[in-house]
């Protein structure tokens, strides 16, 4: 039967727990992204972030991911969700502020 | 290792039922969407039904919709392609699907496929 | 219903370039999806999001997509490149696969 949607941001989560423990070298090279408001269209607007990082195998699976929770199609410099684009941060710390965000979600059982 | 593998496939006659399961191993199948896509004999794919893991929505082809019915059940690891009043043109190997994730899955991509199940439908 | 059209056939000889095309209106709006298929064998995802290839994809697969055409394209094709190829995208809450084609390494 019907599966609560927690499963799909359980995995989520533990895909960029994965990133944060098996980082050794500079995640994607120490690439810069957007920061983004952590908010409503959250999962756009971190896919339209981490979209511009490219030959980062690192993260691959996570833009993958993302795209599952996001409902249009998101290119290479594409900003509609991206409302704010003003500070850049490191791919590392971005990763880590979105996994904080949704282990917060998730506790709260804000799963949409 | 990520597996998928189907059973329940058969000889059934003209306005027959049958069954499809679809084991899964190596993940957890409740976090993902789970497709059937069938193939005719020399032809091509043919999408046939979805079970999205967010909600547990269901998805059909036209040429499926009101005859099949999608499901699944987590406990198991199983999804199921319950077929009924089956006609000829229903003849094909039927592929489980390891599809997508998130409620926007069909945005992921169809990664894990079955070996698939023959499903022939005739008098 | 929305429909994906593509080539009956491509034939290509060994090294060369063999590029396929999927046409369906405003394609290039939905992500493309491409898969292999060999004979007697199970669909493979060999491209996803228009030009990603999965881990253990060889480098030589690459796809693109915009307007109303998705296209893949096998660089130096390889006579194991040899096999039946079917685009996919979703709309209006079905999946549609292409026609497919079928590659051959001359």
């Known amino acids: 039967g019907p599966v609560p949607p927690s499963t799909a941001l359980r995995e989520l989560i533990e895909e960029l727990v994965n990133i944060t423990q098996n980082q050794k070298a500079p995640l994607c090279n120490g690439s810069m992204v957007w920061s983004i408001n952590l908010t409503a269209g959250m999962y756009c607007a971190a896919l339209e972030s981490l979209i511009n990082v490219s030959g980062c195998s690192a993260i691959e699976k996570t833009q993958r991911m993302l795209s599952g929770f996001c409902p249009h199609k998101v290119s290479a410099g594409q900003f509609s969700s991206l409302h704010v684009r003003d500070t850049k941060i490191e791919v590392a710390q971005f990763v880590k502020d979105l996994l904080l965000h949704l282990k917060k979600l998730f506790r709260e059982g804000q799963f949409n | 290792e990520v597996q998928l593998l189907e059973s329940g496939g058969g000889l059934v006659q003209p306005g027959g039922s049958l069954r499809l399961s679809c084991a899964a191993s190596g993940f957890t199948f409740s976090s993902y969407a789970g497709s059937w896509v069938r193939q005719a004999p020399g032809k091509g794919l043919e999408w046939v039904s979805a079970f999205s893991g967010s909600g547990g929505s269901t998805y059909y082809a036209d040429s499926v919709k009101g005859r099949f019915t999608i499901s699944r059940d987590n406990s198991k690891n199983t999804l199921y392609l319950q077929m009924n009043s089956l006609r000829a043109e229903d003849t094909a190997v039927y592929y489980c699907v390891q599809d997508g994730l998130g409620p926007y899955f069909y945005n992921y991509g169809m990664d894990v496929w079955g070996q698939g199940t023959t499903v022939t439908v005739s008098s | 219903s929305y429909e994906l059209t593509q080539p009956p056939s491509v034939s290509v000889s060994p090294g060369q370039t063999a590029s396929i095309t999927c046409s369906g209106d405003?394609?290039?709006?939905?992500?493309s999806f491409w898969f292999q298929q060999k004979p007697g064998q199970s669909p493979v995802l060999v491209i996803y999001?228009?030009?990603k290839r999965p881990s253990g994809i060889p480098e030589r697969f690459s796809g693109s997509n915009s307007g109303d055409t998705a296209t893949l394209t096998i660089s130096g094709t390889q006579a194991m490149d040899e096999a039946d190829y079917y685009c996919?995208?979703?709309?209006?809450?079905?999946?549609?696969f292409g026609t497919g084609t079928k590659v051959t390494v001359l």
């Open positions: 996919q995208a979703w709309d209006s809450s079905t999946y549609v």
């Open positions: 999001h228009d030009s």
């Open positions: 405003k394609l290039g709006d939905k992500y």
